[in-house]
């Protein structure tokens, strides 16, 4: 065994920042630190065969399989994948170890399989086997967490039935409003399923796994807070558990809380109370209303009353199916080049949506914010003043919603020209869409003021580049203008731009750009 080389097999993950495909050893990528693959000598195999731990990667991921060999002298090598030999160029690192790499860019199903590396050193020959598969995320799920009361204890259990099993955490905050943002110092996270401290201002439970993170807030009515202008509304689907917490603080213990549904007291077993003294010796009481599996008849106004506070209500609506309510009519916007502007969509949805903003086939993360009136809003400001079509897409378990936006940036035209033997064409992307003029430059008209009207063909918006309209104008060549300089000008309310073309013979043409504001 001591005669065998010391082999280290590693996997290097790359964060793609290009779209190249293929195998190469020079790549414009950001690499994560190498991950050991526990290369082991395969027992009872003919010849010296090492095997690396099986590698599982996401589709489209870019990786490097690498072997580091601690053996004296030079090494030669050969990669074999699906009976094809692949080029192999070993090099030596700073510790004088032989390094052999196989780069897999943009992993696809066809690139999954066994990669065999044959190495020949001065002392011995050996083989290293890598098995690469694509992670099967089709079976993965991430479900929104829900609450259950812990048996015989005043505590809540947070459950998320997801695959792979999620990490469950409670996110607690004791201040109001903005300071309860996820990364605020006021927020405390507890990575456990059971929560005993149920008196906090804001209580959420989150579950996360490979697919992301889903959270559920414990719906709360605080009798010490001024009621919202619109009645708080809670949506649930048939069969889901209902949890509403009513919270009240008073100078002493001499007060009680009760829940009513449509003026009828909740049945025993559908509520439980907890109380504690706060640091300033005031009494905090909380009363939970809960239904383990709601039915249509659980819909209605739930009112929490106190002997020492004004009562407050919430409207609970039980639906058969989830929904997304928003206006889906497309919207067009016209803004100046430096004007601050955000697209926004206002919607009401249950369950909570997953959403994306898309422009030019590229997706952007989507943030949503709850409004006081039960609606939510998603804004997109990262358009970088690029004109075109922007798409908002939202979905939840039961519904889908798409809304289109067109953004036009008011700007002066910019002209590009091209010419062939029979015609000259000019293109412009300014907005509002420009109008065109063609002028002939001659001895009679050295300033190119002689207008050409014959043989001109204008096409508004002939090419739609992700919603960005391009206007063009074409001049058919006639004997009268052959050999002359012509000038095409595009103009709109923001200015004019021209390009001068020499109409001589086919081939490269000299273009002279001419900007007139």
């Amino acid at each position: 065994n001591q005669d065998l080389p010391v082999i280290k097999c590693v996997l290097i993950n790359h964060k793609n920042n290009d779209s190249s495909v293929g195998k190469s050893s020079s790549y414009p990528m950001v690499s994560e630190s190498p991950e050991d693959l526990g290369c082991a000598l395969r027992p009872q195999s003919s010849g010296t065969v090492y095997e690396a731990a099986a590698v599982e990667v996401d589709v489209s991921a870019s990786i490097t399989l690498q072997v580091l060999v601690d053996a004296p002298g030079n090494i030669s090598c050969l990669w074999v994948f699906k009976h094809s030999s692949l080029n192999c160029q070993p090099h030596f690192d700073l510790q004088n170890r032989g390094v052999v790499s196989m780069v897999i860019l943009k992993m696809t199903e066809t690139q999954a399989g066994e990669y065999l590396l044959f190495i020949q050193s001065e002392a011995t020959n050996y083989t290293i086997l890598f098995t690469v598969s694509i992670r099967n995320t089709l079976l993965y799920t991430l479900r929104r967490p829900y609450f259950r009361k812990m048996e015989n204890q005043d505590a809540l259990v947070c459950i998320s039935e997801s695959v792979p099993e999620p990490i469950v955490e409670w996110v607690l905050c004791d201040s109001q409003g903005e300071s309860c943002k996820e990364e605020s110092p006021a927020v405390v996270k507890k990575e456990e399923k059971v929560l005993h401290e149920l008196f906090g201002t804001d209580i959420r439970c989150c579950a996360r796994n490979e697919l992301g993170r889903e959270c559920t807030r414990l719906f709360t009515i605080d009798l010490n807070q001024t009621p919202q202008t619109t009645l708080p509304q809670l949506f649930l689907k048939v069969g889901e558990p209902l949890w509403i917490r009513c919270k009240a603080v008073h100078v002493n213990h001499g007060f009680g809380l009760t829940w009513e549904l449509e003026n009828k007291a909740l049945e025993e077993g559908n509520y439980f109370e907890m109380s504690t003294y706060s640091t300033n010796r005031t009494m905090i009481r909380i009363l939970f209303a809960f239904v383990s599996s709601v039915a249509r008849n659980d819909t209605g106004y739930y009112t929490c009353s106190s002997s020492k506070h004004p009562s407050q209500s919430a409207l609970v609506t039980i639906v058969e199916k989830g929904f997304i309510n928003a206006t889906n009519s497309s919207e067009d916007y016209e803004i100046d080049q430096y004007e601050e502007f955000c697209f926004s969509v206002r919607f009401k949805a249950y369950p909570q949506i997953r959403c994306t903003w898309t422009f030019s086939r590229k997706s952007f993360p989507c943030e949503q914010k709850g409004l006081d009136n039960g609606y939510s809003i998603s804004k997109f400001c990262n358009h970088k003043h690029q004109p075109g079509e922007y798409i908002f897409h939202a979905e939840n378990d039961d519904a889908q919603f798409t809304k289109m936006f067109t953004l036009n940036i008011r700007r002066k035209p910019q002209v590009l020209a091209e010419a062939s033997a029979s015609q000259a064409s000019c293109f412009s992307d300014g907005y509002p869409l420009p109008s065109w003029t063609w002028k002939k430059c001659s001895d009679k008209s050295p300033n190119c003021t002689e207008e050409i009207t014959e043989g001109v063909w204008n096409r508004k918006a002939n090419r739609k580049v992700f919603g960005q309209w391009v206007s063009s104008s074409t001049l058919n060549m006639s004997e009268a203008i052959k050999g002359f300089l012509v000038k095409c000008c595009a103009y709109n309310s923001l200015g004019t731009s021209c390009e001068t073309i020499l109409l001589n013979s086919p081939g490269p043409f000299p273009f002279i750009q001419d900007n007139i504001s």
């Epitope: 693959l37 082991a40 690396a52 731990a53 599982e56 792979p164």
Partner: antibody, heavy 125, light 107 residues
Framework: QVTLKESGPVLVKPTETLTLTCTVS??????????VSWIRQPPGKALEWLAH???????TYSTSLKSRLTISRDTSKGQVVLTMTKMDPVDTATYYC?????????????????WGQGTTVTVSS | DIQMTQSPSSLSASVGDRVTITCRAS??????FGWYQQKPGKAPQRLLY???TLQSGVPSRFSGSGSGTEFTLTISSLQPEDFATYYC?????????FGQGTKVEIK
Amino acid sequence: QVTLKESGPVLVKPTETLTLTCTVSGFSLRNARMGVSWIRQPPGKALEWLAHIFSNDEKTYSTSLKSRLTISRDTSKGQVVLTMTKMDPVDTATYYCARIPYYGSGSHNYGMDVWGQGTTVTVSS
Amino acid sequence: DIQMTQSPSSLSASVGDRVTITCRASQDIRNDFGWYQQKPGKAPQRLLYAASTLQSGVPSRFSGSGSGTEFTLTISSLQPEDFATYYCLQYNTYPWTFGQGTKVEIK
């Protein structure tokens, strides 16, 4: 450099729940098929295997301690957590976590290849 | 559960001696079996896996044999650094089980 590091309380009271965390570095719990086992060793006694979590998130437990153990992992943090309820003085031991690579199509393994240095837990009132 | 019976529980030997430790499984475990060495205050380290395959970096004086239910660890010429406790492990069937250990002491 492959390392596994156990962390958790040094002292636990009887009936309490013990939570131990194994933080790994130099290898991935996500991109390679790697399992992690917990093993313990009471002072002067033999090694005892406790629990294992597979790369596909499946779990398996010691027959005698099954009802008290829960193993979970957080691949993004590179952590494997073991919780043991109803602690008793006989649970006083050094607790180790160890790595198990899975080979071929991820079906076979050769046991633990790298171990953490261990964390000593004393159960006493 | 599969029982692993290791013998002897302890032995005294001198530097240069040939040492043999055996482990018996209560049922057939094929060659899903390994040997570990543990020094006081340290974590165990794998010596052999698959009954007879030497872990990379382990001296060739260590060797293993056996299959099914009977397994042997042999140290051909004991060195000062080999004085430690040795454990066998079966990883054929869950729950995995260790032998009770063999302490190799200086004579």
